[in-house]
Interface confidence: low
Amino acid sequence: GCLTQLYENAFFRGGDVASMYTPNAQYCQMRCTFHPRCLLFSFLPASSINDMEKRFGCFLKDSVTGTLPKVHRTGAVSGHSLKQCGHQISACHRDIYKGVDMRGVNFNVSKVSSVEECQKRCTSNIRCQFFSYATQTFHKAEYRNNCLLKYSPGGTPTAIKVLSNVESGFSLKPCALSEIGCHMNIFQHLAFSDVDVARVLTPDAFVCRTICTYHPNCLFFTFYTNVWKIESQRNVCLLKTSESGTPSSSTPQENTISGYSLLTCKRTLPEPCHSKIYPGVDFGGEELNVTFVKGVNVCQETCTKMIRCQFFTYSLLPEDCKEEKCKCFLRLSMDGSPTRIAYGTQGSSGYSLRLCNTGDNSVCTTKTSTRIVGGTNSSWGEWPWQVSLQVKLTAQRHLCGGSLIGHQWVLTAAHCFDGLPLQDVWRIYSGILNLSDITKDTPFSQIKEIIIHQNYKVSEGNHDIALIKLQAPLNYTEFQKPICLPSKGDTSTIYTNCWVTGWGFSKEKGEIQNILQKVNIPLVTNEECQKRYQDYKITQRMVCAGYKEGGKDACKGDSGGPLVCKHNGMWRLVGITSWGEGCARREQPGVYTKVAEYMDWILEKTQSSDGKAQMQSPA
């Protein structure tokens, strides 16, 4: 299962499979997730250790039993890989680290006006993996505003140093935000030259391409098919790079296939998993387990559920079968790829789906109407759960926000449907940033069912919550994925980093905004909130947020949208934008429906609708 809790002041002892430098525990966790054998990690922040060599150390670990002994270490952070965590699996890392210099090979330097511009340059450079930016207050004047683009053999910094007035970060290519664009073509009977960065065995060129896409230094590849003339090179996938970023030469060669990494694609990256099953093929590797199951699909599911399993072979040999069940060989290797691929067998083989980010519907466990006043523009993929609820009568207009909480479910405010209960008039847009990008050809979701809380009454503030079941399930991408729900009975006191997003008015008498806005707002206790709203009852099923001095708030058009808070590296849906006195007025906080108080209702409705739980809140 998916385990996302972090252990503070704890270090896992033993089980090391790799180590590197990372700027924080979340990035370390991501590297663990994508490492073929890593199940656990431990991270040492600069403050936790005097040994300069071990500062920012990220230690990736494996364990046969799925656990390792934890020892107390002040400041250390440990946790689990996010393999099997569905939509939480992402190689995208947007954070900027202030006061930190991430070292590597500096291959390009230029003057820029901001760290965001530096990150953009890195994202738009084919070889850049991470960067450092010297701010205007850097102690050496000649280095001020320098943007250094960097790479390293492993894609992570070769060292990380604490350095004032320096800011560092990673390329956003894994966020599908590169402007470079990508080559989707696969070139038959063509071999690329240049430097091999790795060699793995794959059953076809498509798996080879996906591995190349997620390898830190692979820019293009050549695959030797299973009929290649040299037997020892059959099914070999060579991952390649070059100084220029493109192959310096290519040679026509029978039974070879070449292509490019898709990391520079804009808006869509391939999933970091391989779902195809290969009949008549055996995958060799270290035996993890053998089990009797009915059918190759169950074998793949069994492999996916056993977190250490990387690939499998389902044998149909008579001696491997009993009644309707046959042997399912669960296997693994050092690099996550088979150590041998044999053809013409009575088996079928494939890979674990543990890194698929569509995942199960129920993967969201503890990881990771009212325009926003005083907010700033959001960027692509920053709030991938935000949806726009629009009504198409004669014209089409944005009316409310909402939050994607499952493949087929959106959570919003009940009052959005006051006077507009007909589901046919609604269009739901997901994975968008600018409302102006919506044209008649933009895909949208239609509503199958609107479920308004049974105790909601029009023009009252209580139970302002509604579920929308979409007619068709949505696929998850970097720009369209669900928000985790809180635990039932969560106390909001743990949340200190909360944001409200929406396209609503930027002032009380304003208009709908084009670019999705975001604003960081602190939560306010219910007692404080009640003092500000003496004519209304602030119940325990509401949560309030706002600044005493006002100036930042949700407003008309934000209703139904999310109030999300980040805790332990994970975003959770704490509130649904509901009501308030005006917008951003002094001492008049915004009032939000408290999602934790409605967890039973949400789970009941999403289960009873089709008999299967569609999302799961943290344990």
């Epitope: 002892r13 089980g15 046969v64 039993t65 002994p69 387990n289 199951v293 069994t302 559920k305 056993m306």
Partner: antibody
Framework: QVQLVQSGAEVKKPGASVKVSCKAS????????MHWVRQAPGLGLEWMGA????????AYNQKFKGRVTMTRDTSTSTVYMELSSLRSEDTAVYYC??????????WGQGTLVTVSS | DIQMTQSPSSLSASVGERVTITCKAS??????LAWYQQKPGKAPKLLLY???GLEAGFHLRFSGSGSGTHYTLTISSLQPEDFATYYC?????????FGQGTKVEIK
Amino acid sequence: QVQLVQSGAEVKKPGASVKVSCKASGYTFTDYEMHWVRQAPGLGLEWMGAIHPGSGGTAYNQKFKGRVTMTRDTSTSTVYMELSSLRSEDTAVYYCARPYGYPFAYWGQGTLVTVSS
Amino acid sequence: DIQMTQSPSSLSASVGERVTITCKASEDIYNRLAWYQQKPGKAPKLLLYGETGLEAGFHLRFSGSGSGTHYTLTISSLQPEDFATYYCQQYWSTPWTFGQGTKVEIK
């Protein structure tokens, strides 16, 4: 094939220590954790802890913390479990067990430790 | 620690009978459950584990089911060689813990 061969039966006095060995063969010794499980006469099974022979890392059941020590000798592919301050209720068969996936697929033949004055 | 409660503690059954043993965990163990068979004077033998894993060497008449905190082991048609003590064990959270055992005797 995987084999776990344990040392012979021991009789100890209360307050003494016992050290049981478990010699592994048929697989890469440093790749898999070795666990210890005990079974008192007529009673159920009780997990005592584990050692990762590759790293030397250990995990102990809190119940035995301070009394149990697990070590390994990679040159002979042997793990050891030492239990100190023995009392009569420590009379049990002690098993070493190796996981396959997660549960214990391979077990030693067991070592009977009798604590008696 | 997670407590594992097995029931019944013993049962008598005839060859060919269907037998069910239950195991209740004190908290959710997310299907991280193994079943072992032990015969007198011998080490336990892994029988079933996880959601689908039937250990090689055991017949398909053994099956496991359950989720959350409730799990069952079923022997569809008891054979003479099945008379033994059966233990459940959780491997969700250390310390790993076992049920107290169910002794299956010949009626």
